[in-house]
């Protein structure tokens, strides 16, 4: 039985198909030029060395050419996401050539066998591109390979094998099993195109990570940390089908990468922005909302070409459905404590009031713990554009009914039994918008009353554009 193929070795004998099903007539890899948005319309099949179909089907040699490469399939048929992507590409780039790479006979295998077919499919695409390059006006620079799951690594092989350099490869949640940690020639990598951008939506540190966790492109974007996608929880999928199962969750999260890309094509007026960060936890803390030195980028089709010397990991939050865009805010809150309060874990909520709209009540996620007499940084995000922020309501949630919060209350009391009044002082909140990069300072509405305790709230009004106050030295602890 075949084993995974390295960059060397014969290609023609590599098709890994169990003997019992090797009775195929049509070629294993077909190139379907989609001439219409209608999924029922068959389009044209391109054939290596045959120029007539190119002319008959109106292949535009000077236009952009997209190759959509599907992944492993259990069903053996094209899934709905593919038709949506074809339609979105036609909508956005009216003159472009949209080619669907149909390798269903080789993908409709055991996953591991399909993996072992990726190299030969990549080689077929490279040969097609080499042949197209022989035509006048066709340029590899205009070629954009879009691969989903296993298809992302097929795109990598194609980019590796082609004579010259493909303009762009987009990897939509590249497959993880058998590729995680693999040599760069055996998976998608930055060397495979002039620009390789990747969306990771199903990465897991437990169980089996269906999407690859490691960065494999010039930019690697991890929406919602690259793991739990909003709207894909068991509860969400349970609501939409007779039986919500882990497989539905997997499909929802893995496929989310495609829908984020489609969103970037059809909702270009609502682009989602991602921010460079070393890891998901730092991003959750709100530390990484900078656009300086190419530290932020649009995601999906609108991503600006960045060819860093090393991989750039980027993060963002999204909504549960299209349009996926949210508005990110970094909030810096300097917390003073006049009493030694021991370890304290307040549950803070904020409501943002803007010129266009007011936000819902948003939790301040405490990634580690609240530092007293220090600046604490938080990430909050809203689904609607609030416009210019005017004021902020900060609430410290009172004793909750949850056992966890009751335990927190009890533990806090046990550590400080003679401290009945838990109280923190917050004079101002600094806010930075990720999308506009605008910095604002909000001061306590009543400068004489800056204390907050469980069940209480504080109001802050915008008191300055920018962060530095008059006569102010830097705060004790300033996070980057």
């Amino acid at each position: 039985s075949p084993t995974p193929f390295g960059p060397e070795g014969q290609l023609e004998d590599e098709l890994h198909k169990p003997k019992a099903i090797q009775t195929e007539v049509k070629p294993s890899v077909r190139f379907n030029l989609r001439t219409s948005k209608d999924p029922e319309h068959e389009g044209c099949y391109l054939s290596l060395g045959h120029s007539q179909p190119l002319e008959d089907c109106g292949f535009n040699m000077t236009a952009k050419t997209f190759f959509i490469i599907h992944g492993w399939t259990m069903s053996g048929i094209f899934e709905n996401w593919l038709h949506k992507l074809v339609s979105a590409l036609h909508t956005r780039e009216k003159d472009a050539n949209v080619v669907v790479v149909d390798w269903l006979p080789l993908a409709h295998q055991l996953y591991t066998d399909a993996v072992n077919n990726t190299r030969v499919v990549g080689h077929s695409i490279a040969r097609m591109l080499d042949w197209l390059q022989e035509k006048d006006d066709f340029s590899l620079e205009n070629v954009h390979l879009i691969g989903y799951s296993l298809g992302a690594h097929v795109a990598g092989y194609a980019g590796n094998f082609v004579k010259g350099t493909v303009g762009r490869i987009t990897g939509l949640d590249p497959a993880g099993p058998m590729f995680e940690g693999a040599d760069i020639h055996k998976r998608l990598s930055p060397d495979d195109a002039d620009f390789v951008d990747v969306l990771h939506t199903y990465t897991r540190s437990f169980g089996l990570s269906i999407g690859i966790q490691m960065p494999v492109g010039h930019i690697d974007i991890y929406p919602n940390g690259g793991d739990f996608q909003p709207g894909c929880g068991l509860n969400d999928v349970l609501g939409s089908m007779a039986y919500g199962t882990i497989t539905e969750v997997v499909k929802c999260e893995h496929e989310r990468a495609v829908h984020l890309f489609v969103d970037s094509l059809v909702n270009q007026d609502k682009p989602s922005f991602a921010f460079q960060c070393t890891d998901s936890n730092r991003f959750k803390k709100g530390i990484c909302l900078s656009c300086r030195k190419n530290r932020c980028n649009s995601i999906g089709y609108n991503a600006k070409k960045m060819r860093n010397k090393r991989n750039s990991k980027m993060y963002l939050k999204t909504r549960a459905g299209m349009p996926f865009r949210v508005y990110h805010y970094q909030m810096k809150i300097h917390v003073f404590s006049y009493k030694n309060m021991g370890e304290i874990e307040p549950t803070f909520y904020v409501t943002l009031y803007g010129t266009n709209a007011d936000s819902q009540t948003l939790p301040l996620e405490i990634v580690e713990r609240i530092e007293q007499n220090a600046t604490n940084t938080f990430l909050v995000y809203t689904e609607e554009d609030l416009g210019d922020l005017l004021k902020i309501q900060l609430t410290w949630e009172g004793a909750s009914q949850s056992w966890y919060n009751l335990w927190k209350e009890l533990r806090s009391y046990l550590s400080q039994p003679h401290n009945p009044g838990r109280e923190l002082n917050i004079r101002r909140i600094r806010v930075k918008s990720g999308e506009t990069q605008r910095k604002l300072t909000f001061c306590a509405e009543d400068p004489e009353n800056t204390s907050i305790s469980p069940g209480r709230e504080l109001w802050f009004r915008k008191c300055r554009d920018g962060w530095r106050m008059k006569n102010e030295t830097s705060p004790t602890v300033e996070l980057p």
Epitope: S1, P2, T3, P4, H16, P18, M74, S75, G76, I77, H108, L110, Y111, T112, D113, N116, P177, M178, L208, I210, M241, A242, Y243, T245, T247, E248, V250
Partner: antibody, heavy 119, light 107 residues
């Protein structure tokens, strides 16, 4: 919860055929592959083949392709395996099990059906 | 076909013992190795998938390790209910193949 309920024990004559059933419940039937596995008395397990109800896709172990025929009835959420031209070598317990995608494991098993081939 | 070999067909151990069962593949199976438990009544359960991932509901005393061609299943603290036959299976390529099984008994 996921359950695979198999049909009862069968006593059949050499040369005859038998049809075993595996009724699935607790999940979306068309989204998972059902595998069949053979276990002869006191011996190991042998993979026979799979049936994927989503597209009626079937794969067989070469060794069983002239012995087993897999079919399904979506309306009753049941996968069938017909064993033909039975000999004493076919006397065994036959299990159906559900495939977990990507991991290539069998996460849920039926209770097994004992087939005895005897004159 | 890939051959799966469990060299120990029978193993005796005492309750509370740490038990290791090994399995060897005739070629590299890229971690596509699963472990199953068959109880005395014939019931089969998945314990470990993809070499080391614990299937839901399986006690944490079970663990798996290995790579390439050599894999093992460890039970850290043997309990009465663990008395069963254990099979390894490769899911790397068709046809899927199983080891001959290791029957675990109480000393």
């Amino acid at each position: 919860q996921v359950q695979l309920q198999q049909s009862g024990a069968e006593l059949v004559k050499p040369g005859a055929s038998v049809r075993l059933s595996c009724k699935a419940s607790g999940y979306t039937f068309t989204k998972y592959t059902i595998h069949w596995v053979k276990q002869r008395s006191g011996q190991g397990l042998e993979w026979i083949g799979w049936f994927y109800p989503g597209s009626d896709s079937i794969k067989y172990n070469e060794k069983f392709k002239d012995k087993a025929t897999l079919t399904a009835d979506k309306s009753s959420r049941t996968v069938y395996m017909e064993l033909s031209r039975l000999t004493s070598e076919d006397s065994a317990v036959y299990f159906c099990a559900r495939h977990e995608e990507y991991t290539n494991s069998l996460a849920y098993w039926g209770q097994g059906t004992l087939v005895t081939v005897s004159a | 076909d890939i051959q799966m070999t469990q060299t120990t067909s029978s193993l005796s151990a005492s309750l509370g013992d740490r038990v290791t069962i090994s399995c060897r593949a005739s070629q590299d199976i890229s971690n596509y190795l699963n472990w199953y438990q068959q109880q005395p009544d014939g019931t089969v359960k998945l314990l470990i998938y993809y070499t080391s991932r614990l299937h839901s509901g399986v006690p944490s005393r079970f663990s798996g390790s290995g790579s390439g061609t050599d894999y093992s299943l460890t039970i850290s603290n043997l309990e009465q209910e663990d008395i069963a036959t254990y099979f390894c299976q490769q899911g790397y390529t068709l046809p899927w193949t199983f080891g001959g099984g290791t029957n675990l008994e109480i000393k």
